[in-house]
Interface confidence: low
């Protein structure tokens, strides 16, 4: 065992090349200089090292950089990145978007691993906020990224970054997240004309308050049922039958198919049956004529 610690004569690596594939683990350890490896990291990915050989290379880099790898090495890690633990990554200071892209590319097509999540966390914290270019990059690799953030973390997203958000990026967001994102979107798109504004804001409407829905109802937007069903129940309840009719336009007929589901069900229960009848859809469950309709805020005050 002892003689294995010294590099055999003539085996000392002068550069990182394919000849190293045939080295045993102990030979790699003994014959590859860590500083040489660090300067030629870009070559490692072109060489089909075994899983175990990659462990040796990682170990050499760990010994050379116990406080964490420099960005010049990190950018060229390639598949060696998959060997890193979240603990390793927490020691890094990644500032370049190109480095982030290079590492995300390695994991492309796979679900977000704890390593990737840690890398993103380090990168975003280093930048101080989730700027547009970063958001563009992250949502390109992980469409659900935005919805994996807590409302507190989303609060660091500047309104300008909202332009990078695509509808599918918000598919898994819950109301608490949309509550944070909607005001930013409203700010980001405020200078657009009516129809263009609606196209952009539509995905964020799950965070919209009643007043904004009332305003939209005056703009002939023809909201589709899928969007309507994602609205906050508490924002929909105060809308009148006439306002919902204007908001949905020709899509109002879809209410019938959704009458047992929230928020339609709860909204129906708050409307006068006479008003519902004016829609001609056969919606049932409204308040019969002659009954007092309590204001929602008053109801909450009484309970």
């Amino acid at each position: 065992e002892v003689e294995k610690t010294a590099c055999p004569s003539g085996k000392k690596a002068r550069e990182i090349d394919e000849s190293l594939i045939f080295y045993k683990k102990w030979e790699l350890e003994a014959c590859v200089d860590a500083a040489l490896l660090a300067t030629q990291m870009d070559r490692v990915n072109a060489i089909p090292f075994t899983y175990e050989q990659l462990d040796v290379l990682k170990h050499k880099l760990d010994e050379l950089y116990p406080q964490g790898y420099p960005e010049s090495v990190i950018q060229h890690l390639g598949y060696l990145f998959l060997k890193m633990s979240p603990e390793d990554i927490r020691k890094w200071n990644v500032t370049s978007l190109e480095t982030l892209k290079a590492l995300l590319e390695v994991n492309k097509g796979h679900e977000m691993s704890p390593q990737v999540a840690t890398l993103i966390d380090r990168f975003v914290k280093g930048r101080g906020q989730l700027d547009k270019d970063t958001l563009d990059t992250l949502t390109a690799f992980y469409p659900g990224y935005l919805c994996s953030l807590s409302p507190e973390e989303l609060s660091s997203v500047p309104p300008s970054s909202i332009w990078a958000v695509r509808p599918q990026d918000l598919d898994t967001c819950d109301p608490r997240q949309l509550d944070v994102l909607y005001p930013k979107a409203r700010l980001a798109f405020q200078n657009m004309n009516g129809s263009e504004y609606f196209v952009k804001i539509q995905s964020f409407l799950g965070g919209a308050p009643t007043e904004d829905l009332k305003a939209l109802s005056q703009q002939n937007v023809s909201m589709d049922l899928a969007t309507f069903m994602k609205l906050r129940t508490d924002a929909v309840l105060p809308l009148t039958v006439a306002e919902v009719q204007k908001l949905l336009g020709p899509h109002v007929e879809g209410l019938k198919a959704e009458e047992r589901h929230r928020p339609v069900r709860d909204w129906i229960l708050r409307q006068r049956q006479d008003d519902l009848d004016t829609l001609g859809l056969g919606l049932q469950g409204g308040i019969p004529n002659g009954y007092l309709v309590l204001d929602l805020s008053m109801q909450e005050a009484l309970s």
């Epitope: 979240p86 603990e87 999540a117 840690t118 966390d121 994996s148 807590s150 409302p151 507190e152 973390e153």
Partner: nanobody, 119 residues
């Protein structure tokens, strides 16, 4: 040091539900991300879900829509709500976290709780 104690495992029929808990004690103020990791019989460890101190969460694709991770910082407890359980979810489930001290990061694991999904 951090001590992690899991509970809530057991035998459940396919389609059933379980809620796992992991109580943390010791240097809990240093805890950042917490993980649920599982090991099926004869298989290696695989992470199931994790939650950051800020509350952002991730679950692996195979359990998405069925498992939900949460934590109650006031009780120093991590939870995993498992619904629509399948036979392939049978495994020992471990709670895992790390804390920095002494200049390095230290990993901590619970003893594990066995979840068996079988009819």
């Amino acid at each position: 040091e951090v001590q992690l104690v899991e509970s809530g495992g057991g035998l459940v029929q396919p389609g059933g539900s379980l809620r796992l808990s992991c109580a943390a004690s010791g240097s809990t103020s240093s805890i950042n991300t917490m993980y649920w990791v599982r090991q099926a019989p004869g298989k290696g460890l695989e992470w199931v879900s994790f939650i950051s101190s800020g509350g952002s969460t991730n679950v692996r694709d195979s359990v998405k829509g069925r498992f939900t991770i949460s934590r109650d910082n006031s009780k120093n407890t991590l939870y995993l709500q498992m619904n629509s359980l399948r036979a392939e979810d049978t495994a020992v489930y471990y709670c895992n976290t790390y804390i920095p001290y002494g200049g390095t990061l230290h990993d901590f694991w619970g003893q594990g709780t066995l979840v068996t999904v079988s009819s």
